[in-house]
């Protein structure tokens, strides 16, 4: 379990636009402690983007990243 004083990255909301797949370098899923589920994509410019895990493009990107890992 996470230490009480270690902030966990969660999503307030999600991007409303699909990110080009070639911009994406990595991803992680937000913690079950978060109030809403989320996938955080890390772009090649080191920006983090919150995305909705129920959207098809998000699931595809996650699946592709897993396959290439």
């Amino acid at each position: 379990s996470l230490a009480a004083d270690t902030p966990t990255a969660c999503c307030f909301s999600y991007t409303s636009r699909q990110i080009p797949q070639n911009f994406i370098a990595d991803y992680f899923e937000t913690s079950s402690q978060c109030s809403k589920p989320g996938v955080i994509f890390l772009t090649k410019r080191s920006r983090q983007v919150c995305a909705d895990p129920s959207e098809e493009w998000v699931q595809k990107y996650v699946s592709d990243l897993e396959l290439s890992a």
């Epitope: 009480a4 004083d5 270690t6 902030p7 966990t8 307030f12 909301s13 983007v49 919150c50």
Partner: antibody, heavy 120, light 109 residues
């Protein structure tokens, strides 16, 4: 670079409605929320509400009944509308950019504000 | 609605370390309140300094740090500079809305 600019009427008569526009540049409303905050003269900040990329909103519960936030992504504009204004709504009104991730600064860039005076 | 309380004013000297705090009337401030700190300089210039309890915004000097101290959120300025004289507001997230504290006027002299 990131910029936000508020534009409003300046003077509003009591019981009338207020409309303010926040025009942004340097980022897209599809990737960030926009918060609205106000500051009465000589007082602290009061959070009014936020609109998220998909159009969802959260509001200050004390003001929810007379507050509405909307946007036009194609024009990079966000709109605040408040009804039934009274003199204690006199304040500087600000919009601020809202990243979506909780570990980032939640209101990182701010506009310069627009002054609203409620008076007859 | 929650009430968030800050020191109304603090005074420090250049080079000293000063800590501003942020208390919630609903109980202990936790990492789930995602404490933020905003600086107000003259002419209504606002800048977000700290988010998510302890994360500095890009470009914010390393002398600014956020933390939880006891049941409160805290902003510590290690080696205050004269240009740090400003009003500092904390903001706490309560499930679906933000609440600001009343602000701390920091004087550096």
């Amino acid at each position: 670079q990131v910029q936000l600019k508020e534009s409003g009427p300046g003077l509003v008569a009591p019981s009338q409605s207020l409309s303010i526009t926040c025009t942004v540049s340097g980022f897209s409303l599809t990737g960030y929320g926009i918060h609205w905050v106000r500051q009465p003269p000589g007082k602290g900040l009061e959070w009014l509400g936020v609109i998220w990329p998909g159009g969802g909103t959260n509001y200050n519960s004390a003001l929810m009944s007379r507050l509405s936030i909307s946007k036009d992504n194609s024009k990079s504009q966000v709109f605040l509308k408040m009804n039934s204004l009274q003199t204690d709504d006199t304040a500087m009104y600000y919009c601020a950019r809202g990243p979506l991730i909780t570990t980032e600064v939640s209101m990182d860039y701010w506009g310069q504000g627009t002054s609203v005076t409620v008076s007859s | 609605q929650a009430v968030v309380t800050q020191e109304s004013a603090l005074t420090t000297s250049p080079g000293e370390t000063v800590t501003l705090t942020c208390r919630s009337n609903t109980g202990a401030v936790t990492t789930s309140n995602y404490a933020n700190w905003v600086q107000e300089k003259p002419d209504h210039l606002f800048t977000g300094l700290i988010g998510g309890t302890n994360n500095r915004a890009p470009g914010v000097p390393a002398r600014f740090s956020g933390s939880l101290i006891g049941d409160k959120a805290a902003l510590t300025i290690t080696g205050a500079q004269t240009e740090d004289e400003a009003i500092y507001f904390c903001a706490l997230w309560y499930s679906n809305h933000w609440v600001f504290g009343g602000g701390t006027k920091l004087t550096v002299l």
